[in-house]
């Protein structure tokens, strides 16, 4: 079973190093999350061809996934820590009814799905601890998260099959963004 | 096989323009970050921009800061460098290059780069 | 900004020397490291990502380490191909910056 980061032999400090800082233990948390969404893409993209759709079509997709923008402050230009970790925060919390949905999703790499899940959540905690300025983050409805749980669960297969792909592309790009952004802070 | 072709480099007055392309085959390029590279005359390299897939997200160095500004369009499989307020310092082969892809996620590494193209700022 | 320090500058050495090349950062950089090859008038190649990983097609007696702030590239037994300059890349946090080169050539 895939474990987190700081729970196999490898993540564990050498006596003569120094034990992870916050920042650090984010960093490379942020990884493993990255790496378990890489075996889950190889899976759906050797499944089906939406690996090589075109952005287009993809956005023809009318799913509501958190986006970074210049305007969250994560970005090179006009970086700002606060705004930006709100960003990420919510982004997350956003995300975490998609990857409910992809729990039963995949075959060879259900576990892999699982990790990402529970990864995501000790990886909110890990930020909201570093967050000053709590009051500007909003959790989503579990209301509507649950009527969007049932929505996407209805879907055709074709459609099934592209919602997963733009999660993982679209969670990949988000965590990207914000593993760059939290390195400048 | 992968292919990196970059145009639009030449001869220009300080204070004046050009913009670089560069064309990518080979790969799917939407899914790949892009930077671009110079080396002056006879110098090291350095790292110049880079631009990520689709989130827009962009970096500069500090030298070219405000100046230039880094774009694709995905649909014509092409990465641009916008130069304006050209400085002699800026006289420099500039490469264009992709960053490592599949499943490396995190780590920067360019592992295939145009042939370069030459842009000279001189009066 | 996080500084890059490479040494030696120049390295004088003779085919068949196992050769090393260090790079500092000023900051950690994780595992965030890449080393490439440039051959005069060639464009560079990429050898090392990931701090250690090796790059695919690159040959065994190429190999990098560290992890944080130091980082070492070495070449087990020189051949003549080998004879380049050499250039660390951290690609933690922007600007990403390049080392200022190695020039490994003949004594």
């Known amino acids: 079973a895939p474990v987190l980061p700081g729970e196999d032999s490898k993540d564990v400090a050498a006596p003569h190093s120094q034990p992870l800082t916050s920042s650090e233990r984010i960093d490379k948390h942020i990884r493993y999350i990255l790496d378990g969404i890489s075996a889950l893409r190889k899976e759906t993209c050797n499944r089906s061809n939406m690996c090589e759709s075109s952005k287009e079509a993809l956005a023809e997709n009318n799913l509501n996934l958190p986006k970074m923008a210049e305007k969250d402050g994560c970005f090179q230009s006009g970086f700002n820590e606060d705004t930006c970790l709100v960003k990420i925060i919510t982004g997350l919390l956003e995300f975490e009814v998609y990857l409910e949905y992809l729990q039963n999703r995949f075959e060879s790499s259900e576990e892999q799905a699982r990790a990402v899940q529970m990864s995501t959540k000790v990886l909110i905690q890990f930020l909201q601890k570093k967050a000053k300025n709590l009051d500007a983050i909003t959790t989503p409805e579990p209301t509507t998260n649950a009527s969007l749980l049932t929505k996407l669960q209805a879907q055709n297969q074709w459609l099934q099959d592209m919602t997963t792909h733009l999660i993982l592309r679209s969670f990949k790009e988000f965590l990207q963004s914000s593993l760059r952004a939290l390195r400048q802070m | 096989q992968v292919q990196l072709v970059e145009s639009g480099g030449g001869l220009v007055q300080p204070g004046g323009s050009l913009r670089l392309s560069c064309a990518a085959s080979?790969?799917?390029?939407?899914?790949?970050?892009m930077t671009w590279v110079r080396q002056a005359p006879g110098k090291g390299l350095e790292w110049v921009s880079s631009?990520?897939?689709?989130?827009?997200?962009?970096a500069y160095a500090d030298s070219v800061k405000g100046r230039f500004t880094i774009s694709r369009d995905n649909a014509k499989n092409t990465l641009y460098l916008q130069m304006n307020s050209l400085k002699s310092e800026d006289t420099a082969v500039y490469y264009c290059?992709?960053?490592?892809?599949?499943?490396?996620?995190?780590?920067?590494?360019?592992?295939?780069w145009g042939q370069g193209t030459q842009v000279t700022v001189s009066s | 900004d996080i500084q890059m320090t490479q040494s030696p500058s120049s390295l004088p050495t003779s085919l068949g020397d196992s050769v090393t090349i260090t790079c500092q950062a000023s900051?950690?950089?994780?595992?965030?490291l890449s080393w490439y090859q440039q051959k005069p008038g060639q464009t560079p190649k990429l050898l090392i990502y990931g701090a250690s990983r090796l790059q695919t097609g690159v040959p065994s007696r190429f190999s990098g380490r560290g992890s944080g702030t130091s980082f070492t590239l070495t070449i087990s037994g020189l051949e003549a191909e080998d004879l380049a300059t050499y250039y660390c890349?951290?690609?933690?946090?922007?600007?990403?910056?390049f080392g200022q080169g190695t020039k490994v050539e003949l004594k």
């Open positions: 290059t992709r960053n490592l892809g599949g499943v490396v996620v995190t780590t920067n590494g360019y592992d295939y």
């Open positions: 080979g790969f799917t390029f939407s899914n790949y970050y």
């Open positions: 631009i990520y897939s689709f989130s827009g997200d962009t």
């Open positions: 900051q950690s950089i994780s595992d965030e």
């Open positions: 890349l951290q690609g933690y946090s922007w600007p990403f910056m």
